[in-house]
């Protein structure tokens, strides 16, 4: 028997520095977790102790903190090289700055293979990107070889900016011939490494003949066997065992997100490359693991540029940006409108001639807006200003919801109106009218939404049975502020871009902003 140790990360999202337990900015260092310096300590410890070790990443290193905003992926290549990753799969967020923003900072600079079997380049891009990412790679490990085959969410064109010259094929259809090719090369130990979410990971384990292990990402799935060490609630045991259609037991793993855990899976193979056993658990990278001093010193060196960036002007406002709780928790506020407009703008993807865009709606809990920005400071808006407005380090995500769920969400928005509570929704692409004289749960008297399948966008009444795409904070997608109905009833959820980054990019693009209060949210009394 031959034993392989797979160390894996996914959805690190620019958390190069250690973070608090909830993966936001580290405040009390003695209680902080993750970060590449701490990860390196643990990886090196395992490499020294065990003979056959692979360090893999399942995508979405890009996007999530000011590190990515400033360094645009150069930081990913540099520190992944420093940690000696063996391979990485492309995630949807790796395309956030377009194909050029992937090629230049990452694909050209990585000292490790970057993989995806279901992304096919066409047109002029085909030769430009040829060889920079691969469908699979055969890696020598000790005296054996291991095949790693990559995959990426086929929803990427709706979630990021891959352009028109990359085709995202069905994962299973694309993976099978590549696995077959590995088999013909006498590679009998094959890992599928990819970024399509836990449900697809399980399907790959079930359907793709010849895949021995699946290492996934995208859904931030936390798996654990035994008592979990932190706040994350396991979605299943680690590894999650799937019985394939040809009767094999295939371990599937994922390691939550944000570099908080290091996935640790030990696989035993027989001489024919069959998995005999698999066991392990994610390792919580808490403060009991010291940060590696040389990586930490490098982080501190790279940090200097971030501090300078946060005080530079992004753009100007010529109006007061009212982000006060007195406004945003009670009525339409122009800061809410600005943020929602930025969220929609960030999700413009002209992928279908029938639609002017794939999504037109935004909702945003008023309690998530934490500060106004005064225009009397020469109108200057900095990253620092925006960090005061959006201090939680969240993301603006894409969900699919039924109209009936949206209606419940808007009822929840005003179910205890008047108490300055955070659930009051700011909106974009939505016109809502409330009648507060009616009883809670029945206060939404009009709810019109902006059409997407139209050449001239206009507002139509919400249809209860229709499925709508909505951009919202990850906080709401996860049921925060009492929006349990969103969490329970959402049909799809894809993580989006860092909240501050979305707004800062929009402001930089617009140069001068003047958001108004324009009647998106209205109140009526009596009959409507």
């Amino acid at each position: 028997a031959w034993e392989l140790t797979i160390l894996h990360t996914n959805d690190v999202h620019s958390r190069l520095e250690q973070t608090s337990e909830d993966s936001s900015k580290c405040v009390n260092a003695s209680r902080c977790m993750g970060g590449v310096a701490r990860l390196f300590t643990k990886v090196q410890q395992i490499r020294r102790a065990e003979p056959n070790v692979l360090l893999l990443d399942a995508g979405d290193q890009y996007q999530g903190t000011i590190w990515f905003t400033v360094y645009k992926g150069a930081e990913v290549a540099h520190f992944m090289n420093a940690l000696r990753y063996d391979a990485m799969a492309l995630g949807n967020h790796e395309f956030d700055n377009g194909v050029e923003g992937l090629i230049e900072p990452l694909l050209k600079e990585a000292k490790f293979p970057i993989l995806s079997a279901n992304i096919k380049a066409k047109g002029p891009l085909a030769s430009q990107i040829s060889g920079l990412y691969l469908p699979y790679k055969v890696l020598p490990v000790g005296d054996e070889v291991v095949g790693i085959v990559g995959y990426t969410s086929k929803e990427t064109p709706f979630l990021s900016n891959p352009g028109t010259n990359l085709v995202f094929e069905d994962e299973i259809t694309a993976l099978q011939p590549e696995v077959d090719k590995l088999k013909t090369l006498n590679v009998n130990k094959i890992i599928a490494l990819g970024h399509s979410g836990f449900e697809m990971d399980k399907l790959i384990a079930q359907k793709v003949r010849g895949v021995d292990v699946v290492v996934g990402g995208h859904s931030n799935t936390f798996l654990y066997t035994g008592n979990p060490p932190s706040k994350e609630v396991p979605a299943g045991k680690y590894p999650f065992i799937v019985t394939s259609d040809d009767g094999r037991k295939v371990p599937v793993v994922q390691a939550y997100a944000f570099g908080k855990y290091l996935g640790y899976l030990k696989i035993e193979f027989d001489e024919r490359g069959n998995v005999i056993s698999s066991h392990g658990n994610p390792i919580l990278l808490n403060s009991s693991i010291p940060e590696d001093p040389s990586i930490k010193a490098d982080i501190n060196k790279w940090r200097i540029k971030l501090d300078n960036y946060s005080t530079q002007e992004l753009g100007k406002t010529i109006v007061y940006l009212d982000g006060s709780s007195q406004s945003c928790r009670f009525r339409e506020c122009n800061m809410g409108n600005l943020i929602c407009d930025a969220m929609i703008n960030n999700n413009l993807r002209h992928t279908d001639e029938m639609f002017w865009n794939h999504v037109s709606m935004c909702i945003l809990n008023g309690g998530g807006i934490r500060s106004p920005i005064d225009e009397r400071n020469n109108g200057t808006i900095t990253w620092e200003n925006l960090a005061a407005v959006l201090p939680f380090g969240g993301t603006f995500d894409l969900v699919q919801l039924k109209g009936s769920t949206l209606k419940k969400a808007f009822e929840h928005s005003v179910h205890r109106y008047g108490q300055s509570t955070g659930e009051f929704l700011q909106v974009g692409g939505i016109h809502v009218v409330y009648d507060l004289s009616r009883k809670p749960g029945d206060r939404v008297v009009k709810l019109d939404v902006l059409c997407t399948k139209c050449r001239v966008p206009s507002y139509d009444p919400l249809k209860m049975d229709e499925v709508y795409k909505v951009i919202l904070p990850n906080f709401l997608a996860n049921g925060g502020d009492g929006f349990q109905m969103i969490k329970d009833e959402l049909l799809r959820h894809d993580s989006g871009d860092q909240d501050i980054n979305v707004v800062s990019t929009y402001i930089s693009k617009m140069k001068v902003i003047y958001p108004a209060v324009e009647g998106r949210i209205k109140f009526s009394t009596g009959s409507h």
Partner: antibody, heavy 118, light 107 residues
Framework: QVQLQQPGTELVKPGASVKLSCKAS????????LYWVKQRPGQGLEWIGG????????NFNEKFKTKATLTVDKTSNTAYMQLSSLTSEDSAVYFC???????????WGAGTTVTVSS | DIKMTQSPSSMYASLGERVTIGCKAS??????LSWFQQKPGKSPKTLIY???RLVDGVPSRFSGSGSGQDYSLTISSLEYEDVGIYYC?????????FGAGTKLELK
């Protein structure tokens, strides 16, 4: 197939300059860094520097910073290295090589022999 | 700069013999090491990168190993066409640095 073509020889006088070329074919020129390596007669290999053809960004061995200038011409898919103030120490074979995926130096030119002589 | 020390500087070996060439870095180079073969009047040819990853088309009798500061190239069974000079290269840090070379000749 992927190739890097270099002229065979250059004979130059001391104190003069020479511009060596490395013409790429068989791949998209802007997609990979090109590095230059020096080899004195009967000696080992020495890294001079490299250039990213897509944006002209370069990095150098400090030792060659004042000696070598790296440029590219995207229209002709050619990288150039200009060597200035030549002395007999600069007599060597100069290779260009492509820095491939995962930093595998996967393609090499045949080298240009530079002879500095009056 | 990182100094790469190769050993031996030259060696003789018989056909079919197992040959090992060493390369020591002046500091940890994180396995970012390549091996090249050069024949007289020719350009170098990459055999191995990232310590142990064999370049496509290179015979499987070539293998690489090592970590930290110490690395080696092994030819499991020497063949006639393997004679030449072998160089190691570290690419962990700029400037990239080569070893001085090991001349391998037939006994």
């Amino acid at each position: 197939q992927v190739q890097l073509q270099q002229p065979g020889t250059e004979l130059v006088k001391p104190g003069a300059s020479v511009k060596l070329s490395c013409k790429a074919s068989g791949y998209t020129f802007t997609s990979y860094y090109l590095y230059w390596v020096k080899q004195r007669p009967g000696q080992g290999l020495e890294w001079i520097g490299g250039i990213n053809p897509s944006n002209g960004g370069s990095n150098f061995n400090e030792k060659f910073k004042t000696k070598a200038t790296l440029t590219v011409d995207k229209t002709s898919n050619t990288a150039y290295m200009q060597l200035s103030s030549l002395t007999s120490e600069d007599s060597a074979v100069y290779f260009c090589t492509r820095r491939g995926s995962s930093w595998n130096f996967d393609v090499w030119g045949a080298g240009t022999t530079v002879t500095v002589s009056s | 700069d990182i100094k790469m020390t190769q050993s031996p500087s030259s060696m003789y070996a018989s056909l079919g013999e197992r040959v090992t060439i060493g390369c020591k870095a002046s500091q940890d180079i994180n396995s970012y090491l390549s091996w090249f073969q050069q024949k007289p009047g020719k350009s170098p040819k990459t055999l191995i990168y990232r310590t142990n990853r064999l370049v496509d088309g290179v015979p499987s009798r070539f293998s690489g190993s090592g970590s930290g500061q110490d690395y080696s190239l092994t030819i499991s069974s020497l063949e006639y066409e393997d004679v030449g000079i072998y160089y190691c290269l570290q690419y962990d840090e700029f400037p990239l640095t080569f070893g001085a070379g090991t001349k391998l000749e037939l006994k």
